[in-house]
Interface confidence: medium
């Protein structure tokens, strides 16, 4: 069943290359377990770039080694990119999946454009 | 280590009502739905319903609803079943069972009680 | 509600063969993802013990000889080769809708 899921259009990420959105469902049932997905999208591919499922009321957990963390309040998640490079520009989309109890709903946003930026390297001093 | 445990009888007068309970230890009780499971001497498994101790969310089959109320106490990590107005034919087991992540286990019950075993009787 | 058939209601089997037990949905339980449905063991006197999740999934500290198998309506349960302990009764489950349901059990003897 489809659900649907808000995120900004766009986001700046910051100097140190981390970069912030919240996505936010609509949620058409009392929904408990939830599992959300975080995708790229760059030149027609789509590639997943972390995951996580938690129960409401609790911390989103992302595997050790996840580029992502995040936060969720109510039917909204707080999601934190770290460690990007320019050439990580893209579209990320946010999917958002009611686990349980069932019935199983599903949704994907429209995707948030994050531009990064290459710091420019410091000059040397004289 | 995950447990669930249930007292192992209860005998009870027909027409009465009688609470049945679960402790949980070993785990974060407010994560994990419970179910809880009838099964009639020499007879197969009857899903009832299930709460979620994080919300009071229940579900019940529709068979069970005027039977059975669920509820929990997170102080004590305790579920309860309370069965009321007893029959002959709510003689039975009734197990708790904790229902593993969906996302990794897709509704399965990864761990149960000993069960209660419930006599009406006079 | 969704009906789960087990079949056979009871099976014999010889020691170090095969037991293949069915179950049967009333209809899907399947998704494009997964397959909604998991296999118990119990032994008189016990509480049921997950053996498959899934469909397919082995359970933590199950013996490899149980698999499962099987999609959309028509699942199935092997047990090979079979051992003195695996006499039990064996049940289905579904959950890709409440109310979850059992199938009503098969009994397996071992001779």
């Known amino acids: 069943k489809a659900m649907h899921v808000a995120q900004p259009a766009v986001v700046l990420a910051n100097s140190r290359g981390t970069a912030s959105f919240v996505c936010e469902y609509a949620s058409p049932g009392k929904a408990t377990e939830v599992r959300v997905t975080v995708l790229r999208q760059a030149d027609s591919q789509v590639t997943e770039v972390c995951a996580a499922t938690y129960m409401m009321g609790n911390e989103l957990t992302f595997l050790d080694d996840s580029i992502c963390t995040g936060t969720s309040s109510g039917n909204q998640v707080n999601l934190t990119i770290q460690g990007l490079r320019a050439m990580d520009t893209g579209l990320y989309i946010c999917k958002v999946e009611l686990m349980y109890p069932p019935p199983y709903y599903m949704g994907i946003g429209n995707g948030t454009q994050i531009y990064v930026i290459d710091p420019e390297p410091c000059p040397d001093s004289d | 280590q995950v447990q669930l445990q249930q007292p192992g009888s209860e005998l009870v007068r027909p027409g009465a009502s009688v609470k049945l309970s679960c402790k949980a230890s070993?785990?974060?009780?407010?994560?994990?739905?419970v179910h809880w499971v009838k099964q009639r001497p020499g007879q197969g498994l009857e899903w009832i319903g299930n709460?979620?101790?994080?919300?009071?969310?229940?579900n019940y089959d529709e068979k069970f609803i005027s039977k059975a109320t669920l509820t929990v106490d997170t102080s004590s990590s305790a579920a309860y079943m309370q069965l009321n107005s007893l029959t002959s034919e709510d003689s039975a087991v009734y197990y708790c069972?904790?229902?593993?992540?969906?996302?990794?286990?897709?509704?399965?019950?990864?761990?149960w009680g000993r069960g209660t075993s419930v006599t009406v009787s006079s | 509600d969704i009906v789960l058939t087990q079949s056979p209601a009871s099976l014999v089997v010889s020691l170090g063969q095969r037991a293949t037990i069915s179950c049967r949905a009333s209809?899907?339980?399947?998704?494009?993802?997964?397959?909604?449905m998991h296999w118990y063991q119990q032994k008189p006197g016990q509480p049921p013990k997950l053996l498959i999740y899934?469909?397919?999934n082995l359970e933590s500290g199950v013996p490899a000889r149980f698999s499962g198998s099987g999609s959309g309506t028509d699942f199935t349960l092997n047990v090979h080769p079979v051992e003195e302990e695996d006499a039990a009764t064996y049940y289905c489950?579904?959950?890709?809708?409440?109310?979850?349901?059992f199938g009503g059990g098969t009994k397996l003897e071992i001779k």
């Open positions: 069972a904790r229902l593993a992540y969906f996302t990794n286990y897709g509704g399965a019950m990864d761990y």
């Open positions: 070993g785990y974060t009780f407010t994560n994990y739905w």
């Open positions: 709460i979620f101790p994080g919300s009071d969310t229940s």
């Open positions: 209809k899907s339980v399947s998704t494009s993802a997964y397959n909604y």
């Open positions: 899934l469909a397919s």
């Open positions: 489950q579904l959950s890709r809708e409440l109310p979850y349901t």
